[in-house]
């Protein structure tokens, strides 16, 4: 699997899409998790309604939300009120039984609010942004990893 | 406006089977899941089920898996719910209830409209 | 399964009253609950979904309030016809009510 990258800004809420084969992953739930580590496992941060019927239902935990078009096959992941510790990698997956496949590879990157005067230097523009018709979400960009970028920092 | 009419009270036999029904009218019968409560005599309520009358797709309770059956007729708009294998137990008043359909990124779930309920006695 | 705790289960009130109804689930709902009123030989009535927001035509001395698993409905001055049983759902993980509340007139 690539890794997409979608870069929301501090403070704002990111949203990130999914796209699956809705006829191949009928009748599955799904899940959003966060990876631990490079070779870590994938620790499930919020999953789709139980009953799949109710997968557009949007379901929270904390300031992360999640919801399935399962006819148009997009699972939405929303991340309110966006913090740098959101940063990281994370797993759209699809659920069958106790096993899970994943349906994308997720990059957060955490940017610095431009209207932030406290960190002036770090200003970003977004300068390809999305707008989604819910009022929570603000901008987010996203982009593949080219071949060879690593999603972790090195570790020492 | 918005009504769901239910089927008259029923008498069963420990073992039979029954089939309620529930007729909608006063909106787009497609457009709304339907699901099935049911209340024994001074208890509380009980979800049992929800079927999608668009597409007849079901979601049943653990606790009535392989007992409960629901379909739907959209020609008459009527949705059924039946219960095999009778006991005692069973005795209770069933419901059907309305609940929001298929509407991406909805918020909160409810069940606004409900049936009068239908009466099923199981008694030898 | 997640289970709804209703307390108190008998709640003995004069009209004109407040009346506070509480509702625990065994594990976090989020805010996807709901409140019910049922009468003698009725089907029950949504109140309020979303934990408070209230449903069409529903009177405004009816209110909602609470997060996670600690829910409340608030009657800020009972009428006569508010006297019956209240129930609680939560709607977040397969559907399960609470026990009910039962208002009564003191």
């Known amino acids: 699997h690539n890794t997409t990258v979608f870069q929301g800004v501090a403070g704002q809420s990111l949203q990130v899409s999914c796209p699956y084969d809705s006829m191949k992953h009928w009748g599955r739930r799904k899940a959003w998790c966060r990876q631990l580590g490079e070779k870590g496992p994938c620790q499930r941060v919020v999953s789709t309604h139980n009953l799949w019927l109710l997968s557009f239902l949007r379901r929270w935990n904390g300031s992360t939300a999640i919801t399935d078009d399962t006819l148009g096959g997009t699972l939405t992941i929303t991340l309110r009120n966006l913090q740098p510790h959101d940063a990281g990698l994370y797993q759209c997956q699809s659920l069958h039984g106790s096993e899970a496949d994943t349906l994308r590879k997720v990059l957060v990157e955490v940017l610095a609010d431009p209207l932030d005067h406290r960190d002036a230097g770090d200003l970003w523009f977004p300068g390809e942004s999305e707008s989604f018709e819910d009022a929570h979400v603000e901008h987010s960009i996203s982009r593949s990893l080219l071949e060879g970028e690593i999603p972790f920092p090195p570790t020492s | 406006q918005v009504q769901l009419v239910q089927s008259g009270a029923e008498v069963k036999k420990p073992g039979a089977s029954v089939k309620v029904s529930c007729k909608a009218s006063g909106y787009t019968f497609t457009s709304y899941y339907m699901h099935w409560v049911r209340q024994a005599p001074g208890q509380g309520l009980e979800w049992m089920g929800i079927i999608n009358p668009s597409g007849g797709s079901t979601s049943y309770a653990q606790k009535f898996q392989g007992r409960v059956t629901m379909t739907r007729d959209t020609s008459t708009s009527t949705v059924y719910m039946e219960l095999s294998s009778l006991r005692s137990e069973d005795t209770a008043v069933y419901y059907c209830?309305?609940?929001?359909?298929?509407?991406?990124?909805?918020?909160?779930?409810?069940?606004?409209?409900w049936g009068k309920g239908t009466t099923v006695t199981v008694s030898s | 399964e997640i289970v709804m705790t209703q307390s108190p289960a008998t709640l003995s009130v004069s009209p004109g009253e407040r009346a506070t109804l509480s509702c625990r689930a065994s594990q976090s709902v989020s805010s996807n609950l709901a409140w019910y009123q049922q009468k003698p030989g009725q089907a029950p009535r949504l109140l309020i979904y979303?934990?408070?927001t209230r449903a069409t035509g529903i009177p405004a001395r009816f209110s909602g309030s609470g997060s996670g698993t600690e829910f409340t409905l608030t009657i800020s001055s009972l009428q006569s016809e508010d006297f019956a049983v209240y129930y609680c759902?939560?709607?977040?993980?397969?559907?399960?009510f609470g026990g009910g509340t039962k208002v009564e007139i003191k």
């Open positions: 209830a309305r609940g929001p359909g298929y509407t991406t990124a909805l918020d909160y779930y409810y069940m606004d409209v």
């Open positions: 759902q939560q709607l977040d993980d397969w559907f399960t």
């Open positions: 979303g934990a408070s």
